[in-house]
């Protein structure tokens, strides 16, 4: 049966036994800045082009053992959530991956900047259709990272990022705090904000909307046919990147402002239990859970 | 995220170093009265001191970025400091990434075209 997260983002009139918009997002390229990925996993084979871009810090610790499947874990899962054949949102989207996070899931602001610059240069050399950039990472507030995101957004690129997993104000983190970026918090199957250990999803006025981010089934790098459940605002952001890809594939001329407006318009309203957020943040945090449009032009989204 | 709101730096640290005239033989002195600012991550464990993103003013060309980077290296060398230019940015933001001692920040902030300098910091998978 359909995983809870795909059911949650699917408008009721399209719900059936399966979630199957087979070609959703086919006109859009989604860039993923993350760990290395297992690009020949059955769920994503042929859908993800691994670029030659790599800018990562060395792993911490003298006894760190680099195990390929662990190195690929985070990125493989997210690629699967965006465009996986069986558990992906935008099954028609093609992806390009850049490695900016090491085997411990750690990167640098400078490496991320160079990655964003690489995307901009690729866009200039070979202009394609609409671009979505997924940044499933967070660091402390960074003026320069926010500025780079702003420049890329002004060049017509849609940037989607994780709000962060620190149970804190997203405005204290980057790229979550960049106004031009679509910042995504995480909710669970009960429409509760996601708790992650002692922490959880970030919140506040720098969050644009929430999306499923707990117990999300996706491709596992443990084997070429494996699936695994992962949680976090990265998973939530991947859902929104997939939804954005489908919207842009249906309407390639959408501006960032129009896309943001559509994402908000089609979201489920006031379903999140706000008691989870600090009292002073409740009014500032959007009570929106992302969903696909119940398009009257069915073939736009379900080609 | 969330457009239509002012940027909030939160507890982001900003150090403004006023430009003092030093005999550094700058061919292109910065405009009178401007201050380049220094920024670093508010979360101490995430800081990566020793690597800095030098961001230049918006209309700076690649050739000027390269020249500014070389000038920093030359001035640092005169003071007995080794520096390494790791990357020259162009396409999104003009500037360069430099590995150097924090002792050179004051010098770097006085370079022509410099808008601000940010110490590198960590980002994490979420």
């Amino acid at each position: 049966s359909i995983p809870w997260n795909l059911e949650r983002i699917t408008p009721p009139r399209y719900r059936a036994d399966e979630y199957q918009p087979p070609d959703g997002g086919s006109l859009v390229e989604v860039y993923l800045l993350d760990t290395s990925i297992q690009s020949d996993h059955r769920e994503i084979e042929g859908r993800v082009m691994v670029t030659d871009f790599e800018n990562v810090p060395e792993e911490d610790g003298t006894r760190f053992h680099r195990q390929a499947s662990k190195c690929d874990s985070h990125g493989t899962h997210l690629a699967g959530v965006v465009s996986g054949r069986d558990a992906g949102v935008a099954k028609g989207a093609s992806m390009r991956s850049l490695r900016v996070l090491n085997c411990q899931g750690k990167g640098t602001v400078s490496g991320t900047l160079i990655g964003l610059e690489f995307i901009r240069k690729s866009q200039l050399v070979q202009p394609v259709g609409p671009l979505v950039v997924l940044l499933p990472l967070a660091g402390g507030y960074s003026r320069v990272l926010n500025a780079a995101c702003q420049r890329l957004a002004r060049a017509g690129v849609v940037l989607v990022t994780a709000a962060g997993n620190f149970r804190d104000d997203a405005c204290l983190y980057s790229p979550a705090s960049a106004p031009e970026v679509i910042t995504v918090g995480a909710t669970n199957a009960q429409d509760q904000p996601v708790t992650l250990g002692t922490l959880g999803t970030n919140f506040g006025r720098c969050v644009d909307l929430f999306a499923p981010g707990e117990d999300i089934i996706g491709a596992s790098s443990d084997c070429s046919t494996c699936f695994v459940s992962q949680s976090g605002t990265s998973q939530a952001a991947a859902h929104v990147a997939g939804i954005a890809a489908m919207m842009l594939s249906a309407e390639p001329e959408l501006t960032l402002a129009e896309l943001r407006q559509r994402l908000i318009h089609f979201s489920a309203k006031d379903v999140i239990n706000e008691a989870w957020f600090p009292e002073d943040q409740r009014v500032l945090t959007p009570n929106l859970v992302a969903a696909l449009p119940p398009s009257t032009h069915e073939n736009l989204y379900f080609q | 995220g969330a457009m239509g709101q002012e940027d909030e730096d939160g507890d982001y640290e900003e150090l403004v170093l006023a430009l003092r005239s030093e005999e550094d033989g700058l061919a292109e002195a910065p405009e009178h009265g401007t201050t380049a600012t220094f920024h670093r991550c508010a979360k101490d464990p995430w800081r990566l001191p020793g690597t800095y993103v030098v961001v230049l003013k918006e209309e700076t060309h690649l050739s000027q970025s390269e020249r500014t980077a070389r000038r920093l290296q030359a001035q640092a060398a005169r003071r007995g400091y080794l520096t390494k230019i790791l990357h020259v940015f162009h396409g999104l933001l003009p500037g360069f990434l430099v590995k150097m001692s924090g002792d050179l920040l004051e010098l770097a902030l006085k370079l022509p075209h410099v808008d601000y300098i940010e110490e590198d910091s960590s980002v994490f998978a979420q």
């Epitope: 020949d40 059955r42 084979e45 390929a68 069986d86 046919t225 | -």
Partner: antibody, heavy 115, light 109 residues
Amino acid sequence: EVQLVQSGAEVKKPGASVKVSCKASGYTLTSYGISWVRQAPGQGLEWMGWVSFYNGNTNYAQKLQGRGTMTTDPSTSTAYMELRSLRSDDTAVYYCARGYGMDVWGQGTTVTVSS
Amino acid sequence: ESALTQPASVSGSPGQSITISCTGTSSDVGGYNSVSWYQQHPGKAPKLMIYEVSNRPSGVSNRFSGSKSGNTASLTISGLQAEDEADYYCNSYTSTSMVFGGGTKLTVL
């Protein structure tokens, strides 16, 4: 043009081993593994397993476990399938195909096992 | 795993439409979006005709279409032509492997 080119026909005695090669070209190797499929005379298609160009990982059909080995050599863009302890019922055409999706196929390699 | 069930043979006259069924279980056909169909002419390698239930690779005639309901997938060929005479195989993911149907011989009368 995406192509998979296989090695030539083989005649082997029972108990021997055979190693079939499959050279891939025209696409990004690491985006797809290689599936191996065989077809006995007058019979249907049987999936034997899959091997990765990315990390060398394998996924064998239960029936093949222990008797077959699939490997890749990314430096030459070549995948290999070795079958040991051959029996007469291993007589078949052996195909390599691109990935699990098997959207492109090699021309096939006839392996005859006969005493 | 057991082979998917296909009819051994089907036939049709030129211009007609025919449908070949492929029945599995909820662990293969019913559980995945990844059912493919292959055409094989005698002495030739199989050729992909339909992937992911209903998608056609570029270069494949739009006379070929695929669908799925529950645990059964179907290949429909409309406007039957002489060159369509061949063996047809369905294929599906299983949790850890791949499984083919036994094959259907299509005869164009």
